[in-house]
Interface confidence: medium
């Protein structure tokens, strides 16, 4: 079975690598534009130069192309805590990241938010904070893990999952409650 190709891919596959087929004349292969540039005019004929122009400020192309326009530079999302790691150049998009001692939580494939790494107070660090993952904490006795923070077992209600981890404390609380009702 032949994989389905889009029109542009079909046209490009006729030409050797680094060239694309002229949109008005499929017997001509034009040289693609270098990264950092975009297609201003197709080559007029075989062996003649493609008219490529450099991307304007605020735009880029990161690979060889025959795009009619450069791509707009991404903006780091301040409301997501993102900071600019490197500015946009004509051949590279803005690189956004997080501050030191923060990690990225990806709400979706292309959007992340920065959060502070957990310090594991009342516990120990099981796995250190990574670029895309919070610290994994192990809690000391008398504490249970909630929202990746070690919380005192005195805050454990019977309905929560912490009951197994805080069983002795829960029983003590239950005993106190029972004695109060008799």
């Amino acid at each position: 079975l032949v994989p389905h190709l889009g029109d542009r891919e079909k046209r490009d596959s006729v030409c050797p690598q680094g060239k694309y087929i002229h949109p008005q004349n499929n017997s001509i292969c034009c040289t693609k534009c270098h990264k950092g540039t975009y297609l201003y005019n197709d080559c007029p004929g075989p062996g003649q130069d493609t008219d490529c122009r450099e991307c304007e400020s605020g735009s880029f192309t990161a690979s060889e192309n025959h795009l009619r326009h450069c791509l707009s530079c991404s903006k780091c999302r301040k409301e997501m805590g993102q900071v600019e790691i490197s500015s946009c150049t004509v051949d590279r998009d803005t690189v956004c990241g997080c501050r030191k001692n923060q990690y990225r939580h990806y709400w979706s494939e292309n959007l992340f938010q920065c959060f502070n790494c957990s310090l594991c107070l009342n516990g120990t660090v099981h796995l250190s904070c990574q670029e895309k993952q919070n610290t994994v904490c192990t809690c000391h006795a008398g504490f249970f893990l909630r929202e990746n923070e070690c919380v005192s077992c005195s805050n454990c209600k019977k309905s929560l999952e912490c009951t197994k981890l805080c069983l002795p404390q829960i029983e003590n609380v239950k005993g106190t409650e029972d004695s109060g009702t008799t």
Partner: nanobody
Framework: EVQLLESGGGLVQPGGSLRLSCAAS????????MHWVRQAPGKGLEWVSG????????YYADSVKGRFTISRDNSKNTLYLQMNSLRAEDTAVYYC????????????WGQGTLVTVSS
């Protein structure tokens, strides 16, 4: 048609509590990240809290951590924000938002509900 309808706002004294609700329709609620965002008078938007499709994970802005709790009931297509120990600086219009799937931000917003914290 996607609809997000917030309710539960009002006037409350400092230290008081409120529970906001957001009724969702027109999309598969149980598949979406959901968020609360707020806008204080004369200020920009501030992300408050977010929750994963199945109720986990939950995330909070530092300014509300330990005071606010986000939750959802997928059987009722409803998002909640329990706000305790309210402060004057929590005064804002609170919006429920769906998605956040691109560089452009949230897919859809509600019309907002006003929370006023004042004595």
């Amino acid at each position: 048609e996607v609809q997000l309808l917030e309710s539960g706002g009002g006037l409350v004294q400092p230290g008081g509590s409120l529970r906001l609700s957001c009724a969702a329709s027109g999309f598969t609620f149980s598949r979406e990240n959901m968020h609360w965002v707020r806008q204080a008078p004369g200020k920009g938007l501030e992300w408050v809290s977010g929750i994963g499709p199945r109720g986990m994970p939950t995330y909070y802005a530092d300014s509300v951590k330990g005071r606010f709790t986000i939750s959802r009931d997928n059987s009722k297509n409803t998002l909640y924000l329990q706000m305790n120990s309210l402060r004057a600086e929590d005064t804002a219009v609170y919006y429920c938002a769906k998605g956040m799937n691109s560089h452009d931000g949230f897919d859809y917003w509600g019309q907002g509900t006003l929370v006023t914290v004042s004595s």
